[in-house]
Amino acid sequence: APPRLICDSRVLERYLLEAKEAENVTMGCSESCSLNENITVPDTKVNFYAWKRMEVGQQAVEVWQGLALLSEAVLRGQAVLANSSQPFEPLQLHMDKAISGLRSITTLLRALGAQEAISLPDAASAAPLRTITADTFCKLFRVYSNFLRGKLKLYTGEACRRGDR
């Protein structure tokens, strides 16, 4: 991937809108959109006053940890869907888009050098990732959507600005 492709706002916007659409689609369904289990996902809350002053390396740790857990959660969701006897039709399409989106974002972040931004002290001193649980596909997509427009967007914004200097 081109090193700074993720710095083009249209790229992230595409994934943001896909995530939001998935969330809106699943908002209406209840029974068929239950995960039937609690899946651990990252807590997407951001205290922007504190985040703004975090070292970029610390931000990178939180983003990478969150991305890894979210990818795991979405793959688990896909497994649940595969075992479902009567899956809600549009779900499969949105799950596929989410998995593909998370893979692309991971690749784009690597190209940006986000992993190199994590120094050993940052990784060692990072607080354990705060987590919550998702019990519906809607909540899973909501976390995905929140993560993209929260920590990921804030981090890439800062990392891209630094790269411009």
Epitope: L17, K45, N47, Y49, A50, K52
Partner: antibody, heavy 123, light 109 residues
Framework: QVQLVQSGAEVKKPGSSVKVSCKAS????????ISWVRQAPGQGLEWMGG????????DYAQKFQGRVTITADESTSTAYMELSSLRSEDTAVYYC????????????????WGRGTLVTVSS | SYVLTQPPSVSVAPGKTARITCSGD??????VHWYQQKPGQAPVLVIY???ERPSGIPERFSGSNSGNTATLTISRVEAGDEADYYC???????????FGGGTKLTVLG
């Protein structure tokens, strides 16, 4: 129930400073950021800045940078907003608002508001 | 910095539906929150995160965000809904909260 009680109305001279307080009760003071928003007569809402009481980190809107200082005193659960070099255009009602994370939000929203403090700048 | 544009005023008859718009570049990329402010009072949050209602806000209030416009919809409008309404987003590029200019809702009759 969360309540934000603000200090009383002030009349100030141009060039002077004003310090408005906002005392919070109900809930844990340090858990939520406090924002300050002002509203000039007949005008809309304008965000001035906010503070995270845990870290003491404050952030300010570009327009007020250098003129506004927001602080928080955890021992009294009170936030303060000080605006210096006052001019007549600073005549407004100043609100403090406590931010809250609703389920599904990544960014806290202004869920609780004080009643406002009218600051009049006049010579 | 990011700019949100609202119509200065909207008029509606009691019992009808009022729609207040808020436009901005790529607004679906942001979460939009809505506040109601009655004369002489502090603002009250009526919709957060595009379309969610805080407890205590009637179901008549709903929100949407698509295209280049976020919309606050008030169905079966009552005289008590007459107020100024403000949209708000958090602009991640400037790290600032941004409010729209506000819309005065007038309930006719």
């Amino acid at each position: 129930q969360v309540q934000l009680v603000q200090s009383g109305a002030e009349v100030k001279k141009p060039g002077s400073s004003v310090k408005v307080s906002c005392k919070a009760s109900g809930g844990t003071f340090r858990s939520y950021a406090i924002s300050w928003v002002r509203q000039a007569p007949g005008q809309g809402l304008e965000w001035m800045g906010g503070i995270d009481p845990i870290s003491g980190f404050a952030d300010y809107a570009q327009k007020f940078q250098g003129r506004v200082t927001i602080t928080a005193d955890e021992s009294t659960s009170t936030a303060y907003m000080e605006l210096s070099s006052l001019r007549s255009e600073d005549t407004a009602v100043y609100y403090c608002a406590r931010e809250l994370y609703y389920p599904g939000t990544w960014m806290a929203v202004m869920a609780y508001w004080g009643r406002g403090t009218l600051v009049t700048v006049s010579s | 910095s990011y700019v949100l544009t609202q119509p200065p005023s909207v008029s509606v008859a009691p019992g009808k539906t009022a729609r207040i718009t808020c436009s901005g570049d790529n607004i679906p990329e942001y979460y939009v929150h809505w506040y109601q402010q009655k004369p002489g009072q502090a603002p009250v949050l009526v919709i957060y995160r595009d379309n969610e209602r805080p407890s205590g806000i009637p179901e008549r209030f709903s929100g949407s965000n698509s295209g280049n416009t976020a919309t606050l919809t008030i169905s079966r409008v009552e005289a008590g809904d007459e107020a100024d309404y403000y949209c708000q987003v958090f602009d991640e590029s400037s790290w600032h909260w941004v409010f729209g200019g506000g819309t005065k809702l007038t309930v006719l009759g």
